[in-house]
Interface confidence: medium
């Protein structure tokens, strides 16, 4: 019951986390204009991974995509890649974990298979969460080191225009969404890995063995004695090795030619 709960909770937490990673990746507010240090408070600039926007107090809003790939900073490309990898891994992880859920019956899938799938999805969630956290952290570092706006000529899709005024940007809402979402995905992945341990069937290191006593063939099995009488007497009272011990699956209810000499 605890295993099912842990697995289910891990799945839900990861699902919320991945939804958050997707939301953060799509959001425009990765970096926002620091209005406190800017004398022009009527205009609010904010930038995302895919486009840059401006909003005015008059209500005018405009967003423009980054038209070029070659002109964009390599760091921005790296952040995009990390976030996309995180989403893809997370999505695959979700797909795998749906089939791995203990509460869902799919054909005659064994617990060992579900355990393996749970572990796989857990690892995928962990990597997905780490990718998101890494991506957001790289972008945050870009802002801290003023790298983002020092490459204000990133608008090279328009012919390399450079802004005449350097605007200082601060952390946007998307960064916090990304950090939290990445953390949730990571936690969900850890929970799935923990659940995997409980799902895996504990393998016994022994097999049930039949022992044939002299005179009477008695099969001893774990969990109670089960005797079966042999036919005829063993006059020589000699047991050959071949018929001495057999696994439970091999126990026969009739004597074979090897049982008695």
């Amino acid at each position: 019951m605890a295993v099912t709960a842990c697995q289910g909770l891990g799945f839900v937490v990861s699902l919320i986390g991945i939804a958050g990673i997707i939301a953060a990746t799509c959001m425009d507010q990765w970096s926002t204009q620091d209005l406190y240090n800017n004398p022009v408070t009527a205009v609010f600039n904010y930038q995302g991974l895919w486009r840059s926007c401006v909003r005015e107090s008059s209500g005018f809003t405009e967003c423009r995509g980054y038209f070029t790939l070659l002109g964009l900073p390599a760091m921005l490309q790296a952040v995009r890649a990390l976030m996309i990898v995180g989403i893809v891994l997370g999505a695959i992880g979700l797909l795998v974990s749906i089939f791995a859920l203990k509460c869902i019956r799919i054909g005659s899938m064994e617990d060992s298979a579900k355990a393996n799938m749970t572990l796989t999805s857990g690892i995928m969630f962990i990597v997905s969460g780490l990718c998101a956290i890494a991506g957001v952290s790289v972008f945050a570092n870009m802002l801290v080191t003023n790298f983002w706006m020092s490459t204000a000529n990133m608008y090279t899709g328009m012919g390399g225009m450079v802004q005449t005024v350097q605007t200082r940007y601060t952390f946007g809402a998307a960064l916090f969404v990304g950090w939290v979402a990445g953390g949730l995905t990571l936690i969900g992945g850890v929970m799935m890995c923990i659940a995997c341990r409980g799902l895996a069937p504990e393998e016994t290191n022994y097999k049930a063995v039949s022992y044939h006593a002299s005179g009477h063939s008695v099969a001893y099995k774990p969990g109670g004695f089960k005797a079966s009488t042999g036919f005829g007497s063993n006059t020589k009272n000699k047991k050959i090795y071949d018929g001495g011990a057999r696994t439970e699956d091999e126990v026969q209810s009739y004597p074979s030619k090897h049982d008695y000499v």
Epitope: S52, V54, E62, R64, G157, G159, V162, T164
Partner: nanobody, 122 residues
Framework: EVQLVESGGGLVQPGGSLRLSCAAS????????VGWFRQAPGKGLEFVAA????????NYADSVKGRFTISRDNAKNTLYLQMNSLRAEDTAVYYC???????????????WGQGTLVTVSS
């Protein structure tokens, strides 16, 4: 070399009309948002109007709304400002600017013209 050249300025009576033009060269005009700013004698730079790169959206200062109309012709690399019902307070040097956004914030514009003088007087 990028050049923005304004024309169409001059002397006009109050209530009259004037059409300013801004010819762009040395840049992919259709990729830029362009706008008009003005500077009255002894005053600071003031936003007038701007139009997005596609021409799909416009932005006007409250003082000119309903009187001025901004438009662009990407095929001719030209920006226009149709000014109607002109007032004495509209007297200023009008500058054409090219930038990323059609915003009222002058800092968003990277390219500027030399300006054309518009005088509204009786």
């Amino acid at each position: 070399e990028v050049q923005l050249v304004e024309s169409g300025g001059g002397l006009v009576q109050p209530g009259g009309s004037l059409r300013l033009s801004c010819a762009a060269s040395g840049l992919i005009f259709s990729n830029y948002a362009v706008g008009w700013f003005r500077q009255a004698p002894g005053k600071g730079l003031e936003f007038v109007a701007a139009i997005t790169w596609s021409g799909g959206s416009t932005n006007y200062a409250d003082s000119v709304k309903g009187r001025f109309t901004i438009s662009r012709d990407n095929a001719k690399n030209t920006l226009y400002l149709q000014m109607n019902s002109l007032r004495a307070e509209d007297t200023a040097v009008y500058y054409c600017a090219g930038g990323f956004f059609a915003t009222s914030y002058s800092g968003n514009y990277g390219y500027w013209g030399q300006g054309t003088l518009v005088t509204v007087s009786s």
